[in-house]
Interface confidence: medium
């Protein structure tokens, strides 16, 4: 079965649907499941063999205004002796999320949905090695 | 996008808070980025804490398909390619925002929803105490 994209009128339009101007959609930004319970292990960013730091980015014209980004601390991975092993690579793991962007045009304001790529952490991988023929 | 007149007294009186309900343009900015992690990188196979990707599909949500990670092993893969149980593979979880059709089945009416996804796995040193 074809999965509808945002804005596609694949669904039968029920009578209860609110009227929406053409080319736009109604978005309630009161978040469902605001208090999710993350059961992630403690301090994994420091204890990982591919450790990372967090940076908070702030933009008052974005909702949510605060987005946390991770950055890998090393190019290599940390070995059992606590030293960096450059025969392995620390690489970022990324995930897309949606944000609402507020744009000012003179004395008017418009809202735009935007996909943002968030780096959530890092993992240690074996490098891809290309051998010369 | 759809423009909404600003409060009287523009440009000085600016509401710093977002309104509860907004009209947004149907075109999503950066919409065509690659959403299939299997195609975007092979880290899930090359990692010392490899993971499998599971397709989570929901037509009442945008994006309708989200890929979820599940660590393959309890331990991590060592240099010999074996699972080392002295290290732990743990999931990296992230809260993301998606759109939920509200009321259900409506084509152009949504509400933001926060969902928890497991994005990948990382290898960590376990926390253990040794008896003196």
């Amino acid at each position: 079965r074809k999965i509808p994209k945002v804005g596609h009128t694949f669904f039968q339009k029920p009578e209860s649907c609110p009227p929406v101007p053409g080319g736009s959609m109604k978005l309630d930004i009161g978040i469902i499941n605001e208090n999710q319970r993350v059961s992630m292990s403690r301090n994994i960013e420091s204890r990982s063999t591919s450790p990372w730091n967090y940076t908070v980015t702030w933009d008052p014209n974005r909702y949510p205004s605060e987005v946390v980004q991770a950055q890998c601390r090393n190019l290599g991975c940390i070995n059992a002796q606590g030293k960096e092993d450059i025969s392995m690579n620390s690489v970022p793991i990324q995930q897309e999320t949606l944000v609402v962007r507020r744009k000012h045009q003179g004395c008017s304001v418009s809202f735009q949905l935007e996909k943002v790529l968030v780096t959530v952490g890092c993992t240690c991988v074996t490098p891809v090695i290309h051998h010369v023929q | 996008g759809i423009t909404i007149p600003r409060n009287p007294g523009c440009p000085n009186s600016e509401d710093k808070n977002f309104p509860r309900t907004v009209m947004v343009n149907l075109n999503i900015h950066n919409r065509n980025t690659n959403t299939n992690p299997k195609r975007s990188s092979d880290y899930y196979n090359r990692s010392t804490s490899p993971w499998n990707l599971h397709r989570n599909e929901d037509p009442e949500r945008y994006p309708s398909v989200i890929w979820e990670a599940k660590c393959r092993h309890l331990g991590c893969i060592n240099a010999d390619g074996n699972v080392d149980y002295h290290m732990n593979s743990v999931p990296i979880q992230q809260e993301i925002l998606v759109l939920r059709r509200e009321p259900p089945h409506c084509p152009n009416s949504f509400r933001l929803e926060k969902i928890l996804v497991s994005v990948g796995c990382t290898c960590v040193t376990p926390i253990v105490h040794h008896v003196a």
Partner: antibody
Framework: EVQLLESGGGVVQPGRSLRLSCAAS????????MHWVRQAPGKGLEWVAV????????YYADSVKGRFTISRDNSKNTLYLEMNSLRPEDTAVYYC?????????????????WGQGTTVTVSS | QSVLTQPPSASGTPGQTVSISCSGR????????VDWYQQVPGAAPKLLMY???IRPSGVPDRFSGSQSGTSASLAISGLQSEDEADYYC???????????FGSGTKVTVLG
């Protein structure tokens, strides 16, 4: 031998309190997450609470949240469950159980060691 | 009402294979690994399987586990009289922020 021994059960009136203890032996208690699980007469298993190895993280079932408190004393190798505002539906055998792997895990290796249980009866 | 659904009962004659299903959702089985427990009447539960399909030492290889999507299953091959017990699946649930048990399945060995 790895052992868990629960105590503190008994008959109590609704609204009253009770404190269960679980004495651990045969393993490094401070390395392991610990759970409380209960079983009402003739019913299935119901998870109650979990505490991380160091006591920093605690999770509770919705049915006991705000009334029960899980805690541990690693120096005494003992797990506790403080039960307040008890209700008749809290009547059950209460088991403490150990997580199968040390460190972070709350569940991934299953609950590999269980006590024999202590009975709590809430009745007027 | 458990968030992990199991059939209330299953039965078989000695030597047969019995399968028990455990149905959940994305926030539990879809994201976390499943454990299985065996409980004989009057005794504490015993860990039978963890991480979907790993048997702890001492558990016979007649027991096997598998998982697909948001469901898991436990199979008991070469059924024996001592397998008569209640079986529970369990896993973590991110939405509830806790460990959850299935409703339980009573396995009966006939004849």
């Amino acid at each position: 031998e790895v052992q868990l021994l629960e105590s503190g059960g008994g008959v109590v009136q609704p609204g009253r309190s009770l404190r269960l203890s679980c004495a651990a032996s045969g393993f490094i208690f401070s390395n392991y997450g610990m759970h409380w699980v209960r079983q009402a007469p003739g019913k299935g298993l119901e998870w109650v609470a979990v505490i991380s190895y160091d006591g920093s993280n605690k999770y509770y079932a919705d049915s006991v949240k705000g009334r029960f408190t899980i805690s541990r004393d690693n120096s005494k190798n003992t797990l506790y469950l403080e039960m307040n505002s008890l209700r008749p539906e809290d009547t059950a055998v209460y088991y403490c159980a150990k997580v199968g792997a040390s460190g972070d895990y709350y569940y991934s290796y299953g609950l590999d060691v269980w006590g024999q249980g202590t009975t709590v009866t809430v009745s007027s | 009402q458990s968030v992990l659904t199991q059939p209330p009962s299953a039965s078989g004659t000695p030597g047969q294979t019995v399968s028990i299903s455990c149905s959940g959702r994305q926030s539990n089985i879809g994201r976390h690994y499943v454990d299985w427990y065996q409980q004989v009447p009057g005794a504490a539960p015993k860990l039978l399987m963890y991480y979907d399909s790993i048997r702890p030492s001492g558990v016979p290889d007649r027991f096997s586990g598998s998982q697909s999507g948001t469901s898991a299953s436990l199979a008991i091959s070469g059924l024996q009289s001592e397998d008569e017990a209640d079986y529970y699946c369990a896993t973590w649930d991110d939405s509830l922020g806790g460990y959850v048990f299935g409703s339980g399945t009573k396995v009966t060995v006939l004849g």
